[in-house]
Interface confidence: low
């Protein structure tokens, strides 16, 4: 399907406000530190451009593939080597090198400022003074926030951050209406940066097989009664969206997404009764609903997977004949029926499986040998049951934010050599699984802890990648993505770091603890007791939680003093000297 | 032949207690997770509880948490349901089954016994 310019095409399907969106996105997306204004004014220019080849396809230039265009314009920055420094020799490159070097440089931990809300009243002044702007601003700040952000998704935060200003800003108390709708896209945006940066990093380093893999789990366990034909095609299309996507290729993967919502929309019938109330809705809802669509259920007669997969004298032959379609479709047959596991546990079994056919359908009675597969499946599935049921125990027990503790001791513990603000972001990240999931009924379990786990972790890979310090971390990140996991839940004490020496800046703290918010004040209190860890790896639970308990109480009665910052000034050196004391 | 026998069913007033046995044959309990399944009248399956092939990781259904302990016998190649506090709800024909990897899943239940019938009324 070839079009004589690919820019006037994709403007012409996806609409100029799409357009500009997804460029505006793409922009920020490679170029992170780059002032608004300057990416509206590039923004401008290709639109612009654009609609002349809209208007004649055989205009100059208009030929040219996108990469190129928007190359070429990216590279018309003037302050490139100054602000990116070696991205800049991107430039001297030819399309398709110079892409992949803009790729190479997107920074997934830029050092931007931490957004702050402004007052109400003031977000919606500039709310009505111009709406254009205002939206074109929040996709700009949280682009550049979020190099990997999925952009068709993207836009549908944008619609909704529009709607909530829409409606708040004309509401009786303003605050009260648009403060929660704000906190729930937040929250909502990190969730889906991050599941989506797990997407990239299956795509990138682990190439497009991987990622084919998870997507059939997870369509066959949404799509229990689709047939694996119907599975196949969807999962080639997703593939698709993504590749192109991670890839920086905003326009065609919007677009491609679109005509996947189409087709599925066309098309319920034979993939799943759920799908229904999300055709109803407008393009970028519709798109959003079918991603999340609830699993339907399960066909009622589905035979025993034992008899085409370990009971059959066929299984060698049909393996050999094609490996992947006959993973595949063992994998399409295990996840329909059990909307119970994990995708990455459903990955490991058909990892499994696949191992032992390579080695049995070699041997001299294939049969024999692999007819016990299925009872080498069950250490693998009772660990992640047992790990979930061990940790909600712990959850419930604890609480949310002494479980994040419990879990920032874990892994301090296990990678010492981890930067402190890493530690602390992956492991309170870590720690929301327990509310997160532990309320689920047991059968909802394991796919929502397992694979919420696998995406915190990936955002620790992704760190640790930009800066390496640890074998352990690189280990598990790379040798295999299904088993990330449980390489770092296999991570015991690193014997071998030497602990880091007591710095008593680190423990010195001023009367500016007091005015922090709540959560605030858990990132400090999180962030010394990484840094305890560190200088003290072999220190008990009990030992810990004593100098947190009077780090807290030192916090509250300093807090509590008239001269707050003499107090801190006179009790932080006893506070030390008792930790140290404490923890020798 | 691959078997399984339940007995220990009966009447019995609320509050009060009954221990189900189950009796493999033709295989090891010690090899599979060995599942409780009971189904209400006029109601679907519904599971009750689990113990793990090495016996480490035992599950039971919220319904039951605390009254009801699941347990095996290697030696006598059994499993067992000591039920305690039982209610009126509890009434159900008890089925105990294999389950061939862990799966938590009734209908992928490959070995059933006949089940053994609690009545619990006052």
């Known amino acids: 399907d070839t079009h004589k310019s690919e820019v006037a095409h994709r403007f012409k399907d996806l609409g100029e406000e799409h357009f500009k969106g997804l460029v505006l996105v793409a922009f920020s997306q490679y170029l992170q530190q780059c002032p608004f204004e300057e990416h509206v004014k590039l923004v401008n220019e290709v639109t612009e451009f654009a609609k002349t080849c809209v208007a004649d396809e055989s205009a100059e230039n208009c030929d040219k593939s996108l990469h190129t265009l928007f190359g070429d314009k990216l590279c018309t920055v003037a302050t490139l080597r100054e602000t990116y420094g070696e991205m800049a020799d991107c430039c001297a490159k030819q399309e398709p090198e110079r892409n992949e070097c803009f790729l190479q440089h997107k920074d997934d931990n830029p050092n931007l400022p931490p957004l702050v809300r402004p007052e109400v009243d003031v977000m919606c002044t500039a709310f009505h003074d111009n709406e254009a702007t205002f939206l074109k601003k929040y996709l700009y700040e949280v682009a550049r926030r979020h190099p990997y952000f999925y952009a068709p998704e993207l836009l549908f935060f944008a619609a909704r951050y529009k709607a909530a200003f829409a409606e708040c800003c004309q509401a009786a108390d303003k605050a009260a209406c648009l403060l929660p709708k704000l906190d729930e896209l937040r929250d909502e945006g990190k969730a889906s940066s991050a599941k989506q940066r797990l997407k990239c990093a299956s795509l990138q380093k682990f190439g497009d097989r991987a990622f084919k893999a998870w997507a059939v789990a997870r369509l066959s366990q949404k799509f229990p009664k689709a047939e694996f034909a119907e599975v196949s095609k969807l999962v080639t299309d997703l593939t698709k969206v993504h590749t192109e996507c991670c890839h920086g290729d905003l326009l065609e993967c919007a677009d491609d997404r679109a005509d996947l919502a189409k087709y599925m929309c066309e098309n319920q019938d034979s993939i799943s009764s759920k799908l229904k109330e999300c055709c109803d809705k407008p393009l970028l809802e519709k798109s959003h609903c079918l991603a999340e669509v609830e699993n339907d259920e399960m066909p009622a007669d589905l035979p025993s997977l034992a008899a085409d997969y370990v009971e059959s004298k066929d299984v060698c032959k049909n393996y050999a004949e094609a490996k992947d379609v006959f993973l595949g479709m063992f994998l399409y047959e295990y996840a329909r029926r059990h909307p119970d596991y994990s995708v990455m546990l459903l990955l490991r079994l058909a990892k499994a499986y696949e191992a032992t056919l390579e080695k049995c359908c070699a041997a001299a009675d294939p049969h024999e040998c692999y007819a016990k597969v299925f009872d080498e499946f069950q250490p693998l599935v009772e660990e992640p049951q047992n790990l979930v049921k061990q940790n909600c125990e712990l959850f419930e027990q604890l609480g949310e934010y002494k479980f994040q503790n419990a879990l920032l001791v874990r892994y301090t513990k296990k990678v010492p050599q981890v930067s402190t603000p890493t530690l602390v972001e992956v492991s309170r990240n870590l720690g929301k699984v327990g509310a997160k999931c532990c309320k689920l009924p047991e059968a909802k379990r394991m796919p929502c802890a397992e694979d919420y786990l696998s995406v915190v972790l990936n955002r620790l890979c992704v760190l640790h990648e930009k800066t390496p310090v640890s074998e352990k971390v690189t280990k598990c990140c790379t040798e295999s993505l299904v088993n990330r996991r449980p390489c770092f839940s296999a991570l015991e004490l690193d014997e071998a770091y030497v602990p880091k020496a007591f710095n008593a800046e680190t423990f010195t703290f001023h009367a500016d603890m007091c005015t922090l918010s709540e959560k605030e004040k858990q990132v400090k209190k999180q962030t010394a007791l990484v840094e305890l860890v560190k200088h003290k790896p072999k220190a008990t639970k009990e030992q810990l939680k004593g100098v947190m308990d009077n780090f807290a109480a030192f916090v509250e009665k300093c807090c509590k003093a008239d001269d707050k910052e003499a107090c801190f000034a006179e009790e932080g050196p006893k506070f030390v000297a008792a930790s140290q004391a404490a923890l020798a | 032949e691959v078997q399984l026998l339940e007995s220990g069913g009966g009447l019995v007033k609320p509050g009060g207690s009954l221990r189900l046995s189950c009796a493999a044959s033709g295989f090891t309990v010690s090899s599979y997770t060995m599942n409780w399944v009971r189904q209400a009248p006029g109601k679907g399956l519904e599971w009750v509880s689990s113990i793990s092939s090495s016996g480490r990781y035992i599950y039971y259904a919220d319904s039951v948490k605390g009254r009801f302990t699941i347990s095996r016998d290697n030696a006598k190649n059994s499993l067992y349901l000591q039920m305690n506090s039982l209610r009126a709800e509890d009434t159900a024909v008890y089925y105990c089954?294999?389950?061939?990897?862990?799966?938590?899943?009734?209908?992928?239940?490959?070995?059933w016994g006949q089940g053994t019938m609690v009545t619990v009324s006052s």
């Open positions: 089954a294999r389950d061939p990897r862990m799966v938590g899943n009734p209908h992928e239940f490959d070995i």
